[in-house]
Interface confidence: medium
Amino acid sequence: VTGSRVYPANEVTLLDSRSVQGELGWIASPLEGGWEEVSIMDEKNTPIRTYQVCNVMEPSQNNWLRTDWITREGAQRVYIEIKFTLRDCNSLPGVMGTCKETFNLYYYESDNDKERFIRENQFVKIDTIAADESFTQVDIGDRIMKLNTEIRDVGPLSKKGFYLAFQDVGACIALVSVRVFYKKCPLTVRNLAQFPDTITGADTSSLVEVRGSCVNNSEE
């Protein structure tokens, strides 16, 4: 069940973690000691499900978190918006060498919506994500931490859907929101011709040819 959040009209949301009511229940590997689902609040006192990890003291971290299956709804290119906080390693005493300030984003295309395990070698890396603003202990004391927003796109996609995965290699992160969406050109009327909602092409610059139809009371 999802609550509605307002986004631009040309964006169609496939996944919005902040709108999910109840647990997200994404798959973490290892099952314990890595990513942990944590309930926090939004400004309206509504619970938000987040994922957090902070194993900055231990070396050789390899913690994976995988979303549920996401249908692509015919989109060839999708966008992933991640909002997160990330702790500044310099503000953590005694963690030099083990603490990181990045995490990795992956995807895996699949027609199977019920894959139960994370098979790391199936996933394709999208990017390494770093924070524009990491926070220090002073920020925690002052009780305000800026949210970083990073958007990545992936495509062309061809299977029915896909999974996203987040790999932590030793950072202190809270994933506050994950939104996956595609873009469309909304219904348009030009010179008495009507063109339907159209999903954008595989590339950001792709032109998509669409057949229009005459508006009511007009003819070709």
Partner: antibody, heavy 126, light 112 residues
Amino acid sequence: QVQLQQSGAEVKKPGSSVKVSCKASGYTFTGYYMHWVRQAPGQGLEWMGGIIPIFGTANYAQKFQGRVTITADKSTSTAYMELSSLRSEDTAVYYCATAPMVCSSTSCYLRGFDYWGQGTLVTVSS
Amino acid sequence: DVVMTQSPLSLPVTPGEPASISCRSSQSLLHSNGYNYLDWYLQKPGQSPQLLIYLGSNRASGVPDRFSGSGSGTDFTLKISRVEAEDVGVYYCMQALQTPITFGQGTRLEIK
């Protein structure tokens, strides 16, 4: 529902240390800030410091820096406050209190102290 | 440190009458995100404090709507529209914009 269960009353000698525990239940321990606040007999409230378990190190009031240590054990959902070099002026009721992390679309902040423990009376007397 | 000053320190009120407590901070508690980092707490006799109002004007869960918070920057007010016998106790304002977090001296509300 959220509950914070604190350890029992303590009587300590000047110069010694005391360690007060606060066991949390009913919420995800790692996602909330855990504060410690004390109240001397007949006096007001005084903030000592706090910690977000997921983010590790604690933050202390300058007044207590070097004497207080706040820690959190994620495995048992328990926070601890240890105060050393005790003096008679440290006689007080010590409270733990939690504040949830709240996130808007641009920032996360830590809200007011939603839940409080029942308090632990620490008496420092020779 | 941010100094919090409450007035009055003692407030005798007749049940059913309104009550108002003022809290002034030595520097602005308005953050650039638009929130005032000012909370109000009530400590009933023999009990732990409880949160009434957070971020200046938001009522905490389960708090009766006769309690309201207002103000911005350095001047804040807690109002009780109709005082009831169960409202007796000490009211504290608290700034949470920066550490150390600091409290007002407290206002003791008593029934006339």
